[in-house]
C-alpha cells in the first residue's frame, strides 16, 4: 500500500550534469543545458516528485511526473520507460507499482540518488546513450557503483 504525501518540483541531472527533460514526443532525454536553458525549457525540465508513505518501508517511495499541457507520470511497465498521461494517484493498493520508484541516496553521498523500480527488484532508472540521444531507461544493474544509475535532484521550490 502506498499513500501520497507531499510533492516537490525538481530538476534531475545525470552525473555528467546533463538535464533530464521531456521532449515533444514525450520521451525522457538528457541534454547539456545552461541554467538559463533549463529555465527557458520549463516546464519540460521541471519534474514533480511526489512522495508516498509505504506500508513496508523500503526507502523513499516516489512518483516522477511532469506537467506540460497535461500531467504525465513516469512508468516502467514491462520494463519500458515511458510517460503515461495520468496524475499520480493518492493511494496505490499494492506493494508494487510501475509508477513507484524507491529514491535512495548512494551510500556516503547524500547528493547522489538512485531510483529503483518497485515492480522490478534490481532494476534502476539509468541514463544510456543510444546513437546521438541520451535516454532515460530502466536497467537491470548489479554494478551499483555504475555512474549511469546515479542522479542529482535539485529542488526548485
Amino acid at each position: 500500500y502506498f499513500g501520497k504525501l507531499e510533492s516537490k518540483l525538481s530538476v534531475i541531472r545525470n552525473l555528467n550534469d546533463q538535464v533530464l527533460f521531456i521532449d515533444q514526443g514525450n520521451r525522457p532525454l538528457f541534454e547539456d543545458m545552461t541554467d538559463s536553458d533549463c529555465r527557458d525549457n520549463a516546464p519540460r525540465t521541471i519534474f514533480i516528485i511526489s512522495m508516498y508513505k509505504d506500508s513496508q518501508p523500503r526507502g523513499m517511495a516516489v512518483t516522477i511526473s511532469v506537467k506540460c499541457e497535461k500531467i504525465s507520470t513516469l512508468s516502467c511497465e514491462n520494463k519500458i520507460i515511458s510517460f503515461k498521461e495520468m496524475n499520480p494517484p493518492d493511494n496505490i493498493k499494492d506493494t508494487k507499482s510501475d509508477i513507484i520508484f524507491f529514491q535512495r541516496s548512494v551510500p556516503g553521498h547524500d547528493n547522489k540518488m538512485q531510483f529503483e523500480s518497485s515492480s522490478y527488484e534490481g532494476y534502476f532508472l539509468a541514463c544510456e546513450k543510444e546513437r546521438d540521444l541520451f535516454k532515460l531507461i530502466l536497467k537491470k544493474e548489479d554494478e551499483l557503483g555504475d555512474r549511469s544509475i546515479m542522479f542529482t535532484v535539485q529542488n526548485e521550490d
Epitope: 518501508p57 523500503r58 526507502g59 524507491f102 535512495r104 548512494v106 551510500p107 556516503g108 553521498h109 529503483e116 527488484e121 534490481g122 537491470k140 548489479d142 554494478e143 551499483l144 557503483g145 555504475d146
Partner: antibody, heavy 126, light 107 residues
Framework: QVQLVQSGAEVKKPGASVKVSCKVS????????FHWVRQAPGKGLEWMGR????????KYAERFKDRVTMTEDTSTDTAYMELSSLRSEDTAVYYC???????????????????WGQGTLVTVSS | DIQMTQSPSSVSASVGDRVTITCLAS??????LTWYQQKPGKAPKLLIY???KLQDGVPSRFSGSGSGTDYTLTISSLQPEDFATYYC?????????FGQGTKLEIK
C-alpha cells in the same frame, strides 16, 4: 538454505579445456547471478566473471575473456564454467557463488556473494 | 580496474586480542564492500556486507567500518576459531576485485 554443489576434481593436460558445473539445491529467489572465483594453491581469491540466469548475459574479467565461457541451464538450476587453452598456472580451486541483493534497514541494496560451492580442484599437468 | 590494497598480509595475535585489518580502494566504492573469512580447504564465508552490516549468524565481535576508499574489519576479542584468512571484496564496479588477503595466525 541455498546450497551449491560443484562437480568433482579434474586433471587436464595443457591446451585442453575443462567444464565445471554448479548445481543449486534448496530454495533460491529470483534476481540472483552466478559468479565464478578461483584460487591458485596458496594464493588469494580471483574473480573470473558472472552470468545472469535471467538473460544469460555475462561479464568476464579481462584476463579470462578470450578463454572462459559461462553458461546456465535454468531447467536444472545449474551453472557451468568452461575454461579453454589450459596452462599450468590455471591449476586452482574454482568456486561458484551466488550474487544476490541484501538490503539495509532503509531498503538500500547491496550485492553479496552469499552461498558458495565447495570448490572444484582443477589440476593442469603434462 | 579498482585496486584493493589489503593490509597487513599477515598478523600474529593471541586469543582475546583486538585485531584490525584494512582495505584501501583505488577509488570511491560507495561502501559496496564485503568481508569474507576463509579457512584452509573451505570456501569463503560472508562476514560483513555494505562495509558495516553483520551477516546473520556472525558473532558480534566482528565489525566493519569505513566509506569512500578506506575500510576496516575489526575483531574485538579473538577467539580460537577466528584464526583464518580474511579477504575484502569491492562490489561497486566490474571487474570485481578482492584484497590480497590477511592471514591471521596464532602468536
Amino acid at each position: 538454505q541455498v546450497q551449491l554443489v560443484q562437480s568433482g576434481a579434474e586433471v587436464k593436460k595443457p591446451g585442453a579445456s575443462v567444464k565445471v558445473s554448479c548445481k543449486v539445491s534448496g530454495e533460491i529467489s529470483t534476481g540472483y547471478y552466478f559468479h565464478w572465483v578461483r584460487q591458485a594453491p596458496g594464493k588469494g581469491l580471483e574473480w573470473m566473471g558472472r552470468i545472469d540466469p535471467e538473460d544469460d548475459s555475462t561479464k568476464y574479467a579481462e584476463r579470462f575473456k578470450d578463454r572462459v565461457t559461462m553458461t546456465e541451464d535454468t531447467s536444472t538450476d545449474t551453472a557451468y564454467m568452461e575454461l579453454s587453452s589450459l596452462r599450468s598456472e590455471d591449476t586452482a580451486v574454482y568456486y561458484c557463488t551466488t550474487w544476490r541483493i541484501y538490503r539495509d534497514s532503509s531498503g538500500r541494496p547491496f550485492y553479496v556473494m552469499d552461498a558458495w560451492g565447495q570448490g572444484t580442484l582443477v589440476t593442469v599437468s603434462s | 580496474d579498482i585496486q584493493m590494497t589489503q593490509s597487513p598480509s599477515s598478523v600474529s595475535a593471541s586469543v582475546g586480542d583486538r585485531v584490525t585489518i584494512t582495505c584501501l580502494a583505488s577509488e570511491d566504492i560507495y561502501t559496496y564492500l564485503t568481508w569474507y573469512q576463509q579457512k584452509p580447504g573451505k570456501a569463503p564465508k560472508l562476514l560483513i556486507y555494505g562495509a558495516n552490516k553483520l551477516q546473520d549468524g556472525v558473532p558480534s565481535r566482528f565489525s566493519g567500518s569505513g566509506s569512500g576508499t578506506d575500510y576496516t574489519l575489526t575483531i574485538s576479542s579473538l577467539q580460537p576459531e577466528d584464526f583464518a584468512t580474511y579477504y575484502c571484496l569491492q562490489g561497486s564496479k566490474f571487474p570485481l576485485t578482492f584484497g590480497q588477503g590477511t592471514k591471521l595466525e596464532i602468536k
